[in-house]
Amino acid sequence: AVNGTSRFTCFYNSRANISCVWSQDGALQDTSCQVHAWPDRRRWNQTCELLPVSQASWACNLILGTPDSQKLTAVDIVTLRVMCREGVRWRMMAIQDFKPFENLRLMAPISLQVVHVETHRCNISWKISQASHYFERHLEFEARTLSPGHTWEEAPLMTLKQKQEWICLETLTPDTQYEFQVRVKPLQGEFTTWSPWSQPLAFRTKPAALGKDT
């Protein structure tokens, strides 16, 4: 939802969290603001306190329940409002009718581990976190490997077009330190975006055997 120089963007993690960012040029830093969530067909509502993340933007997380509980369904619509205190009253600064499963951003994959490492290859696995069972196998992943002397931005992206929670990295250099990251995205949702990148997993390939051609 955009009003002039105001921007209000929210994403659902598919289970029990809606994360929102509100930015407003010229807004006072010390103003107390909240996000209010009112589902159209549920008995609960939820509020979170917007906290500054930069000069003109604030963020908060609406915690809807325990992390793995399915608090919203594909047919829910949630009215989200930014409310700011002006003296003794609250003023509505932004509003949107939010379709949770059209605005998805999953949690970053977790539990990255090296399953098997060789001189030129490394097999890595991971798990998805707090992802709805609604998606079945209809998820995709992107992965990247940080090589010595390069930055993450330079790392080529590898795409996994199905729910495959492992990868076999090939053509690696022996006895070399690497880092690996992965992120996930459901196919569902017009405004769905990639999860944050996972925490990097550091690993080292095995040295080449002495006296053998590599």
Epitope: Q70, T73, A74, H133, Y134, E136, H138, Q188, E190
Partner: antibody, heavy 117, light 107 residues
Framework: EVQLVQSGAEVKKPGATVKISCKVS????????MHWVQQAPGKGLEWMGW????????EYAPGFQDRVTITADTSTDTAYMELSSLRSEDTAVYYC??????????WGQGTTVTVSS | EIVMTQSPATLSVSPGERATLSCRAS??????LHWYQQKPGQAPRLLII???QSISGIPARFSGSRSGTEFTLTISSLQSEDFAVYFC?????????FGQGTKLEIK
Amino acid sequence: EVQLVQSGAEVKKPGATVKISCKVSGFNFKDSLMHWVQQAPGKGLEWMGWIDSENGETEYAPGFQDRVTITADTSTDTAYMELSSLRSEDTAVYYCARGGPWFLSYWGQGTTVTVSS
Amino acid sequence: EIVMTQSPATLSVSPGERATLSCRASQIISNNLHWYQQKPGQAPRLLIIYGLQSISGIPARFSGSRSGTEFTLTISSLQSEDFAVYFCQQSNNWPYTFGQGTKLEIK
């Protein structure tokens, strides 16, 4: 292998109630949404509703919500659809299906229900 | 309720030729459109999701595309087993609705 096996054909009188079962295997029933779809001769495919086996929550299409009840028994991996106050236009093939909320990945073989006096 | 209109109602094509089936939504549904195939006496089978994503195990000759509210299912080179009824289905607004079907028959 994913399998959904439905109960057999039914003949009912107008005003009666029918209950169809759908026994599943080959996947984790508790992680599934189980759907029911009607295919009547002149009306095509109509989505009746679903149940989330994880939490028992149901969603019914407005055209059916007054007469349909969908349940799931996680101890036997079986979903049920009960349709009450039957009328002649309910004569149809009824399918159970598994999928996320948005589309139906696997289907049962169908159960024919005939409503006739 | 969103109305899905499929055209043509019947399509006659020779084996080996290309078939193009159309599905139009009565309002904007983003890419929330899925295709099924149904053969006589059988349940429908999911072919394509989100307008263009093929389901694993479905032959590569089946493909989908979208232009606004108009969606197209293309079968590049028809095999004998492809002659069936094809349904589209929207999942943008509940209740989710199906098109009335296109019957693909042998010419």
